[in-house]
């Protein structure tokens, strides 16, 4: 649901905010299929808008636009920018567009400035999860106006969404268009319920937040505002105490057993046959350990039958 209501904003002059996006996509919090290379876990640039209730960049349970599809699938912002600009020109529903640089790792920060005014007090943005089929995080219509005042700050935990345009199950799934297109759905620890899904953690009631956004109102002062550095990799400048990083348990996953091998031995002492399976997913963070990967069984050799 949109985070803003239909209440009329009667705040005074336009307000400036700093928006800080913090990636929390770590291998500890999200150990399953965590992308380590080609490409490693990272975030696209952030693209957002300050707008009125006449405009919707994206909304849960609704279909995304072509522009948002391109952004969610490939990180291409051009078509989405054009759609935002068109909404601004036709309906005057968009006041300003803002963007922040990409975050080159799963954990880190990026920041931007934005301005809202009382007719355009809602903020929406999207950041693509890289790599992914069409997954993103973002905010839909967060209202920074609180009656006759501007909110001093706002902070939200962010969770992954599926744009409904690509049917891939995993971070690195090849392109596989969803036909017909589906609506935007939240990805949870149990939905999609397929064990192959990269966010499928059946032992968790809910996923830990994969990102967080903080908006802080900027006070007008004679001194020029100095925005934070655009990208702060968390290993150097982690805001959150590392003890608070959730350790999501990842259970070992093994393949099905192979077929039984030949029965070796002879007719007096009988024989043994064996079968094997392999580790699909190594356990992490105190997840269930892997079971035996080889099994032997007694058997009657073929030439004794």
């Amino acid at each position: 649901q949109p985070l803003g209501g239909e209440s009329i904003c009667s705040a005074g002059a336009p307000a400036k905010y700093s928006i800080t996006f913090t990636g929390k996509w770590s291998q500890t919090a999200f150990p399953k299929q965590y992308p380590l290379f080609r490409p490693p876990a990272q975030w696209s640039s952030l693209l957002g808008a300050a707008h009125s209730s006449d405009y919707s960049m994206w909304r849960k349970n609704q279909y995304v636009s072509n522009g948002l599809r391109d952004f969610a699938e490939r990180g291409e912002a051009w078509a989405l920018m054009k759609e935002i600009e068109a909404a601004g020109e036709a309906l005057q529903s968009v006041h300003a567009v803002f963007s922040a640089p990409a975050v080159p790792s799963g954990t880190g920060q990026t920041s931007a400035e934005l301005e809202v005014q009382r007719r355009h007090s809602l903020v929406s943005f999207v950041v693509r999860i890289v790599p992914s089929p069409d997954w993103f995080v973002g905010v839909d219509s967060l209202d920074l106006c609180d009656g006759d005042r501007w909110r001093e700050q706002a902070a939200l935990d962010l969770y992954p969404y599926d744009a409904g345009t690509d049917s891939g199950f995993t971070f690195s799934s090849p392109n596989f268009a969803t036909i017909p297109q589906d609506t935007v759905t939240e990805i949870t620890s149990s939905s999609p319920s397929h064990p192959a899904n990269s966010f499928y953690y059946p032992r968790l009631k809910a996923l830990p937040p994969i990102a967080r956004v903080t908006l802080v109102r900027l006070r007008q002062s004679p001194r020029a505002f100095i925005p934070p550095a655009p990208v702060l990799p968390s290993r150097d400048n982690e805001i959150v105490d590392s003890a608070s990083v959730p350790e999501t348990p990842l259970d070992c996953e093994v393949s099905l057993w192979s077929s039984w091998g030949l029965c070796g031995g002879h007719c007096g002492r009988l024989g043994t046959k064996s079968r094997t399976r392999y580790v699909r997913v190594q356990p992490a963070n105190n997840g269930s350990p892997c079971p035996e990967l080889e099994e032997e069984a007694e058997c009657v050799p073929d030439n004794c039958v």
Partner: antibody
């Protein structure tokens, strides 16, 4: 002393049943593959059945479906349940241990310990 | 199944003589999976040789086995009085079969 002591033989009518027992002592019974063999009067030796350490069983075609081999490791015992007995089943029955034991060790890789034998007579 | 043929059927020898018993298989016995047993009247068989040539525990060294493939031999270098008995060969390569036996009797 390593030994196998048999019991349970006797006279039975054709079509009747009999259960033979074989008690092992002096060795880790559960670790060995055990067999039943028989020897008709004045004839040679014939293999009857085998049971592995894991319970896998196998039978000679001549007794398949009529005889059942089993073991009770807690009692260090081997059994042969014989049903639908025929005249041609009359023989001296022996239980025997297959001497192979352990991994990579092939000590006495054959029937190394035999029971004393028990006679099964099938007659009307 | 593999048929084992023992020869001779009876061997008449005196104590101190050398005994040579033959066992021929109808097809090759893999990995020398062949054993020899001794049986005296009213007794259970006793293991002498396994793996065609390995002496079982406690068997005197006058007993020796040899051969591979289809032809196997049990040799008793010097017959002792207690050696007069019936000898069986047995293969465990394909199913479990015994030869018909060779009786070694006192001449």
């Amino acid at each position: 002393e390593v030994q196998l002591v048999q019991s349970g033989g006797g006279l039975v009518h054709p079509g009747g049943s009999l259960r033979l027992s074989c008690a092992g002592s002096g060795f880790t019974f559960s670790s060995y593959v055990m067999h039943w063999l028989r020897q008709a009067p004045g004839k040679g030796l014939e293999w009857v059945s085998v049971i592995g350490t894991g319970g896998v069983t196998h039978y000679a075609d001549s007794v398949k479906g009529r005889f059942t081999i089993s073991r009770d490791n807690a009692k260090n015992s081997l059994y042969l349940q014989m049903n639908s007995l025929r005249a041609e089943d009359m023989a001296m029955y022996y239980c025997a241990r297959w001497g192979y034991y352990g991994s990579g060790s092939y000590e006495n890789d054959a029937f190394d310990i035999w029971g004393q034998g028990t006679m099964v007579t099938v007659s009307s | 199944e593999i048929v084992l043929t023992q020869s001779p059927g009876t061997l008449s020898l005196s104590p101190g003589e050398r005994a040579t018993l033959s066992c021929r298989a109808s097809q090759s016995v893999s990995s020398s999976y062949l054993a020899w047993y001794q049986q005296k009247p009213g007794q259970a068989p006793r293991l002498l040789i396994y793996g065609a040539s390995s002496r079982a525990t406690g068997i005197p060294d006058r007993f020796s086995g040899s051969g591979s493939g289809t032809d196997f031999t049990l040799t008793i270098s010097r017959l002792e009085p207690e050696d007069f008995a019936v000898y069986y060969c047995q293969q465990y390569s394909s199913s479990l079969t015994f030869g018909g036996g060779t009786k070694v009797e006192i001449k």
